[in-house]
Amino acid sequence: NKILVKQSPMLVAYDNAVNLSCKYSYNLFSREFRASLHKGLDSAVEVCVVYGNYSQQLQVYSKTGFNCDGKLGNESVTFYLQNLYVNQTDIYFCKIEVMYPPPYLDNEKSNGTIIHVKGKHLCPSPLFPGPSKP
């Protein structure tokens, strides 16, 4: 039996930050679980991990080069990615493992979310014309 995951098909990070919500067909309340976010078509880079345990507060691991935090809902984990770079535009996949109670469960591969990171563009300073000549 596999957990199903729903993600937005695409998100745009205008201010170099984005909230990606992973919605699961499973209630995480009172479970020991590991939710993770993976970058790339082959999911080769694990960007962020959120670990939940009924007996302690949420723990978050963020890979070097990514500023990440997580928030838990009953059937969702939202990843908050900040300080993203334009070259981190890619497809990101949500994964979930439930370790306790048995049986161990994980998810069917989701369709992923394309995160498009828009670069910050500095606005040109307004031109102040000099004093007009009489």
Partner: nanobody, 125 residues
Framework: EVQLVESGGGLVQAGGSLRLSCATS????????MGWFRQAPGKEREFVAA????????SYTGSVKGRFAISRDNTKNTVYLQMNSLKPEDTAVYYC??????????????????WGQGTQVTVSS
């Protein structure tokens, strides 16, 4: 900070044995999957073996099955790789890796969160 330190590498003749150790510090080791990878000169890092949190479940790459055995001692925060019937093609730098808060026997290097510095294993013919 999490640290992984490998030891036990060295030079051995073909057919010989070595036991690698990887000591971890900086976290509660018993909630993590541990893995061994290796990298030969000019080649990509490849998966060798992994062990789950309890030590009851293991996974191996095909070329080492029946020759290598991974184990762990959660009281000592240490994972081991017993390597028997070594072959010249086992020559590589061996790395241990830690996958946080998991029970999934991952085989991709990108699915591991922390790495040791590696220990050299050389098998002479």
């Amino acid at each position: 900070e999490v640290q992984l330190v490998e030891s036990g590498g060295g030079l051995v003749q073909a057919g010989g044995s070595l036991r690698l150790s990887c000591a971890t510090s900086g976290r509660t080791f018993s909630s993590d999957v541990m893995g061994w990878f290796r990298q030969a000169p000019g080649k990509e890092r490849e998966f060798v073996a992994a062990i789950n949190r309890s030590g009851h479940s293991t996974s191996y790459t095909g070329s080492v099955k029946g020759r290598f055995a991974i184990s762990r001692d959660n009281t000592k925060n240490t994972v081991y790789l017993q390597m028997n019937s070594l072959k010249p093609e086992d020559t590589a730098v061996y790395y241990c890796a830690l996958r946080l808060w998991s029970d999934y026997l991952a085989q991709k290097s990108g699915e591991y969160n922390y790495w040791g510095q590696g220990t050299q294993v050389t098998v002479s013919s």
